[in-house]
């Protein structure tokens, strides 16, 4: 049994990084292998993951973490029983994929502008709170070709846009996703997606 | 191995105050965030409060915002619960709990809140 | 605030059951949720966290799955130690929030 593409992780920078690999044939992830977690400093602990499968040779663990700070690093351990398949380590700050935004909605009724608003995945306390800048993708039901992306790169999480950009009398739907350059971080997942009908007054043509 | 013994619970009159105190040993307690949790008699459990080891944020549950404060003493290895101006909906057992998410738990105190 | 609602509140069951307990929360949660398992008289015991990944040394008859926020608890094959108080936890956002505990009893 060997590791055919060794261990990648990435950090939410709060309580979750999620490790991925893949092995050299089709393997029971949970059964034959485990990953070993371990912060660098003194009199800390080890901690097991149990991975689960990733398709056929492919397997992910989730490692619990305390809140995160840009000190920590951990050692990783992947084994096979009592053979050690691959050793590394990994530092949660400089690897991480931010969580995705929640509670996107599309408010409508602001005269004949469109107020996308969502959370900020994180609490006020966490580095990245404060750095997050997003991305809004905006996309027509019945047209495929009508796909639009915001760049957002203030920090309020919202967007304001004239529903006349859009087309009326078509169902829209709209999801976000964050990413903070102070860490390099790749972008999140993108949030659920959120559906409504663009409707507005077209403006009164004098002939 | 990791321990957590809670301390200072006892019956208390509505209106009164207590300090809880949990002490920890076998793990880096500066390392670790921190939470209380209480347990009413016959009910479900229920978060009360979470300090940061990174920060030092904490943070509270709606029902003892304003009331409680949580805090804690690396020198000492020792978290704190300060309960102010008890209701009798706070009797409960409460158990203090290390981070990540609960991993350790305490044997809890029993406080009673009654006239 | 998140809720987060569990059932059933309480079910009977054999040994060798098995048995689905379902978590819903109120808005997504991704995968931040965790299911513990507390015996009478003694304190809850993480089973599962981040939604499906056991906990070392925990059964493999115990399972998780979802994501968002419909989650379930499954034990394959109920053994005479499961019978317990079962809760789910969602740790997305502050505060965090407990379900009202599903209890399995003996049929």
């Known amino acids: 049994m060997k590791v055919l593409q060794e261990p990648t992780c990435v950090s939410d920078y709060m309580s979750i990084s999620t490790c991925e690999w893949k092995m050299n044939g089709p393997t029971n992830c949970s059964t034959e292998l485990r990953l070993l977690y371990q912060l660098v400093f003194l009199l800390s602990e080890a901690h097991t993951c149990i991975p689960e499968n990733n398709g056929g040779a492919g397997c992910v663990c989730h490692l619990l973490m305390d809140d995160v700070v840009s000190a920590d690093n951990y050692t990783l351990d992947l084994w096979a029983g009592q053979q050690l398949l691959w050793k590394g380590s990994f530092k949660p700050s400089e690897h991480v994929k931010p969580r995705a935004p929640g509670n996107l909605t599309v408010h409508t009724n602001v005269s004949d502008t469109l107020l996308l608003t969502w959370s900020n995945p994180y609490p006020r306390d966490n580095y990245l709170y404060n750095h997050l800048t997003y991305a809004v993708n905006i996309w027509s039901e019945n047209d495929p070709a009508d796909f639009r992306i915001y760049n957002v790169t203030y920090l309020e999480p919202s967007l304001r846009i004239a529903a006349s950009t859009l087309k009326s009398g078509i169902s829209y739907r709209a999801r976000v996703r964050a990413w903070a350059q102070c860490y390099n971080t790749t972008w999140s997942e993108w949030s659920p997606s959120t559906k409504w009908h663009n409707s507005y007054r077209e403006p009164f043509e004098q002939h | 191995q990791v321990q957590l013994v809670e301390s200072g619970g006892g019956l208390v009159q509505p209106g009164g105050s207590l300090r809880l105190s949990c002490v920890a040993s076998?793990?880096?307690?500066?390392?670790?965030?921190m939470n209380w949790v209480r347990q009413a008699p016959g009910k479900g459990l229920e978060w009360v409060s979470y300090?940061?080891?990174?920060?030092?944020?904490?943070y509270y549950a709606d029902s003892v915002k304003g009331r409680f404060t949580i805090s804690r003493d690396n020198a000492k290895n020792s978290l704190y619960l300060q309960m102010n101006s008890l209701r009798d909906e706070d009797t409960a057992v409460y158990y203090c709990?290390?981070?990540?998410?609960?991993?350790?738990w305490g044997q809890g105190t029993l406080v009673t809140v009654s006239s | 605030d998140i809720q987060m609602t569990q059932s059933p509140s309480a079910m009977s069951a054999s040994v060798g059951d098995r048995v689905t307990i379902t978590c819903r929360a109120s808005?997504?949660?991704?995968?931040?949720l965790a299911w513990f398992q507390q015996k009478p008289g003694k304190v809850p015991t993480r089973l599962i966290y981040?939604?499906?990944s056991l906990q070392s040394g925990v059964p493999s008859r115990f399972s998780g799955s979802g994501s968002g926020t419909e989650f379930t608890l499954t034990i394959s094959s109920l053994q005479p130690e499961d019978f317990a108080t079962y809760y789910c936890?969602?740790?997305?956002?502050?505060?965090?929030?407990f379900g009202q505990g599903t209890k399995v009893e003996i049929k």
């Open positions: 709990a290390r981070e990540p998410v609960f991993d350790y």
């Open positions: 076998g793990f880096t307690f500066s390392h670790s965030s």
């Open positions: 300090i940061s080891r990174a920060t030092g944020a904490v």
């Open positions: 808005q997504d949660i991704s995968n931040y």
């Open positions: 981040a939604a499906s």
């Open positions: 936890l969602q740790w997305s956002s502050y505060p965090r929030t």
